[in-house]
C-alpha cells in the first residue's frame, strides 16, 4: 500500500502535487509498512479495542487562516478516556481517586511503555531496531527522551505527508509559500506503541485556509456603550477602533503596515500607520465603516524579464521596483503583476486586508455627575441607618435605570448593589435616595443606563455618626 491509499481520498491534481511542495514533507506515493502499522477502515471492529477503557479522541486545530508565505501551525491533542492521563515518563496512568465505569483501578498503569521498551530485544548498540521506524521505514529521531514518546502522528495534506513521534500533544508548522490559495484539508492519523508494532487509535481531519488577503479583525470600544458587540454606538462620544491582524507566525513583523479608514459619514479618508484610531460620529444613523490594510510582505520573485531591446538603455537593478500588488486568486506566486527582481531573491509584494462593518449611531447618556448630596433627616431620634439623597445630572438621552454600588473606601469590596427604574424630567435632573448602615467612608458608584448606554460616576462619601451637628462630607469626587 502507498500512503495515499491509507491516509485519505483527497487526491490533488498533478498540477497541485507539483506546485505545492512542502518543505520537509514527502510524497504520498511512498510505500506504507502495513505490517508495522496496520490499516483499519472506518467501522472496523478492531477500533473498539484499540485502547484500554474506551476510545481516544484526537482534536486537530490550526491557527488558520494563514497569509500565503507565512507559517501555519497545526496542533493535535489526544483526549483519553475518563480517569486516564499521560505521566512524566510518557506512560498512560489512571488518575488517583478518580472513578470511571469500571470503578477504581488496582493497576496504576493503562499502558506501561517504559517496561515494554526495557524488555524489548533485538536492538543494536545505538538503540535502533527494525520496529523503531515510521510507516515509510525512516528511523525515529533519537533525541534525548525519545523513548518517552509513544505516539506516532502522520499528517497528510496536498499529496504529501509528515511523520512525527510525540507525546499526547504535538505541533507541526508548515510554510505556506507554495500552497494553493483557498481551503485545504489536513488529515492526521495517530498510532500508539504496541509491543514491536503499532496500533491506530485515532483519525482526525480539519480544513485550513491559505489566503492572499491579510486576515483583519477590528475591535470597537466606546465609553458608556452598553454592549460593544452589537455594533450600536453613541453619538458625540469617541469610538476607539483597534485593528488586530491575524499573524500568529509574525510573518508581517518587519512590514510597514498602513491603515486606510473611511467612516462612512462624509469625513473623508483617514490614513494612518497606527493600528488604533478614534472617531466620533456627530449624527444619528447607520454608517458603513471601511478599512483597507496594506502591508509590504516577503513574496515570490517573478521570472526574469526578457532581455531589453538594444535601442533602450538597461535600467540598473537598484532602480527596479521592489514590490508588486497581489489581489488575484490562484497559486501563490503566479500573479503576473507589477513585479521586480532583486539580486538576493528577496522580493516584496503588497498584500491587502479589508474590513467592513455597518454601525448604528444612536443617542446615549454621555455624562453623569453627582452635583449634591444631602443627609435626609429622619423622624426617629437616633436611627441606625442614614438616608442620603444624591442629586444627579446627566447629558444625552433619557436614563431608564439607576444603579448604585456601595463599597468600601478602596472601591473594591462591594457591600450593596441596588438598581431600579428611574423617571427623569426633561432637564435630566434626578434624586437618588440610598440607605447607609452606620457611619464611615463609602465608595459610591452611580450608573445611569438606558437601552444602549451606561454612564458611571464615582464618589467617596463620609457618613458621620448620627449626631445631628455632624455634616455629610463628599470625601473625594
Amino acid at each position: 500500500k502507498r500512503f495515499h491509499d491509507v491516509l485519505g481520498n483527497e487526491r490533488p491534481s498533478a498540477y497541485m502535487r507539483e506546485h505545492n511542495q512542502l518543505n520537509g514533507w514527502s510524497s504520498d506515493e511512498n510505500d506504507w509498512n502495513e505490517k508495522l502499522y496496520p490499516v483499519w477502515k472506518r467501522g472496523d471492529m478492531r477500533w473498539k479495542n484499540s485502547w484500554k477503557g474506551g476510545r481516544v479522541q484526537a482534536v486537530l486545530t490550526s491557527d488558520s487562516p494563514a497569509l500565503v508565505g507565512s507559517n501555519i501551525t497545526f496542533a493535535v491533542n489526544l483526549i483519553f478516556p475518563r480517569c486516564q492521563k499521560e505521566d512524566a515518563n510518557g506512560n498512560i496512568v489512571y488518575e488517583k481517586n478518580c472513578r470511571n465505569e469500571a470503578g477504581l483501578s488496582a493497576d496504576p498503569y493503562v499502558y506501561n511503555w517504559t517496561a515494554w521498551s526495557e524488555d524489548s530485544d533485538g536492538e543494536n548498540g545505538t538503540g535502533q531496531s527494525h520496529h523503531n521506524v515510521f510507516p515509510d521505514g525512516k528511523p525515529f529521531p533519537h533525541h534525548p527522551g525519545w523513548r518517552r514518546w509513544n505516539f506516532i502522528y502522520v499528517f497528510h495534506t496536498l499529496g504529501q505527508y509528515f511523520q512525527k513521534l510525540g507525546r499526547c500533544s504535538v505541533r507541526v508548522s508548515v510554510n505556506t509559500a507554495n500552497v494553493t490559495l483557498g481551503p485545504q484539508l489536513m488529515e492526521v492519523t495517530v498510532y500508539r506503541r504496541h509491543g514491536r508494532a503499532y496500533v491506530p487509535i485515532a483519525q482526525v481531519k480539519d480544513v485550513y485556509v491559505v489566503t492572499d488577503q491579510i486576515p483583519v479583525f477590528v475591535t470597537m470600544f466606546q465609553k458608556n456603550d452598553r454592549n460593544s458587540s452589537d455594533e450600536t454606538f453613541l453619538k458625540d462620544l469617541p469610538i476607539m477602533f483597534d485593528v488586530l491582524i491575524h499573524d500568529p507566525s509574525h510573518f508581517l513583523n518587519y512590514s510597514t503596515i498602513n491603515y486606510k479608514w473611511s467612516f462612512g459619514d462624509n469625513t473623508g479618508l483617514f490614513v494612518s500607520t497606527n493600528h488604533t484610531v478614534n472617531h466620533t460620529y456627530v449624527l444619528n444613523g447607520t454608517f458603513s465603516l471601511n478599512l483597507t490594510v496594506k502591508a509590504a510582505a516577503p513574496g515570490p520573485c517573478p521570472p526574469p524579464p526578457p532581455p531589453p531591446r538594444p535601442s533602450k538603455p538597461t535600467p540598473s537593478l537598484a532602480t527596479t521596483l521592489k514590490s508588486y500588488d497581489s489581489n488575484t486568486p490562484g497559486p501563490a506566486g503566479d500573479n503576473p503583476l507589477e513585479l521586480s527582481r532583486i539580486p538576493d531573491e528577496n522580493c516584496q509584494i503588497n498584500r491587502y486586508g479589508h474590513f467592513q462593518a455597518t454601525i448604528t449611531i444612536v443617542e446615549g447618556i454621555l455624562e453623569v455627575n453627582i452635583i449634591q448630596m444631602t443627609d435626609v433627616l429622619m423622624p426617629v431620634p437616633w436611627p441606625e441607618s442614614s438616608l442620603i439623597d444624591f442629586v444627579v445630572t446627566c447629558q444625552g438621552s433619557i436614563p431608564t435605570e439607576v444603579c448604585t454600588i456601595i463599597s468600601d473606601p478602596t472601591c473594591e469590596i462591594t457591600q450593596n448593589t441596588v438598581c431600579s427604574p428611574v423617571d427623569v424630567d426633561e432637564m435630566c435632573l434626578l434624586t437618588v435616595r440610598r440607605t447607609f448602615n452606620g457611619s464611615g467612608t463609602y465608595c459610591v458608584n452611580l450608573t445611569l443606563g438606558d437601552d444602549t448606554s451606561l454612564a458611571l460616576t464615582s464618589t467617596l462619601i463620609s457618613v458621620p455618626d448620627r449626631d445631628p451637628a455632624s455634616p455629610l462630607r463628599m470625601a473625594n469626587s
Epitope: 441596588v418 431600579s420 423617571d423 440607605t435 437601552d451
Partner: antibody, heavy 116, light 110 residues
Framework: EVQLLESGGGLVQPGGSLRLSCAAS????????MSWVRQAPGKGLEWVSS????????YYADSVKGRFTISRDNSKNTLYLQMNSLRAEDTAVYYC?????????WGQGTLVTVSS | QSVLTQPPSASGTPGQRVTISCSGS????????VSWYQQLPGTAPKLLIY???QRPSGVPDRFSGSKSGTSASLAISGLRSEDEADYYC???????????FGGGTKLTVL
Amino acid sequence: EVQLLESGGGLVQPGGSLRLSCAASGFTFIRRPMSWVRQAPGKGLEWVSSISHSGGSKYYADSVKGRFTISRDNSKNTLYLQMNSLRAEDTAVYYCARKWSTFDYWGQGTLVTVSS
Amino acid sequence: QSVLTQPPSASGTPGQRVTISCSGSSSNIGNNYVSWYQQLPGTAPKLLIYADSQRPSGVPDRFSGSKSGTSASLAISGLRSEDEADYYCGAWDSSLNAYVFGGGTKLTVL
C-alpha cells in the same frame, strides 16, 4: 391635560388571548416609561408590567412572565398589553399608568373577565 | 401575601390625625422611593405622595409622607369624610425587579 384611555377588555375563555390598548395624550409620550397595573374584584393593586420610553427595557411580574407582552407604538402614542394563555386569576380591571418608579397618572381601567 | 405590609384598616373622626404604616425591606422601601396612592370607591387610583414625602400639585398639604429605614408612613391630618378611601403604598423592589404594592388600608371616617 394628561389623559390615558384603556380599551380592549372583555370576556374571554381560559387559555384565550386579548390585547389591551392605552391611548395617551396631553404629554410627550415618547419621553415617558409606561406601566400596566391590575386590580382583581375586591382585591388590592397588583403591578403587571412596565416599559421604557423607547421600548428597549421591559419588566414583568412573575405571575405574567412568558404569557403577557408589553409594547408601545410611539408614533401612535399607544401602549399595548398582549395577554395570552389567560387564566381565571387574570380577571381584573387593568389600568394603564404613566411612568414606572411611581405612577403619577392613571387611566380609568378596562375590565378583563376570564371565564368559561 | 403582599411584599409590603399595611394594616388592613384604619379609622378616625373628622379633624383627627391618622397614620397608616407600610413596612418592607432594604430591597424595596430601604433603598427605593415610596409612593402612596388613594383609591376612592369606584374610581381609579390617584398618586398622593411620591419620593417618600413629595406631594404632586393639587394634593392638599393635610397629606404627608415619611420614611425611616425599611418603613414608611402616610399621615392625614384634619381628617375629612371625603378622605374615606383605600390607601396603597408602593415601591420598586430591586431584588424582585418588580414594583410592589402593600395590600391596602381601608380608611373609614367615623
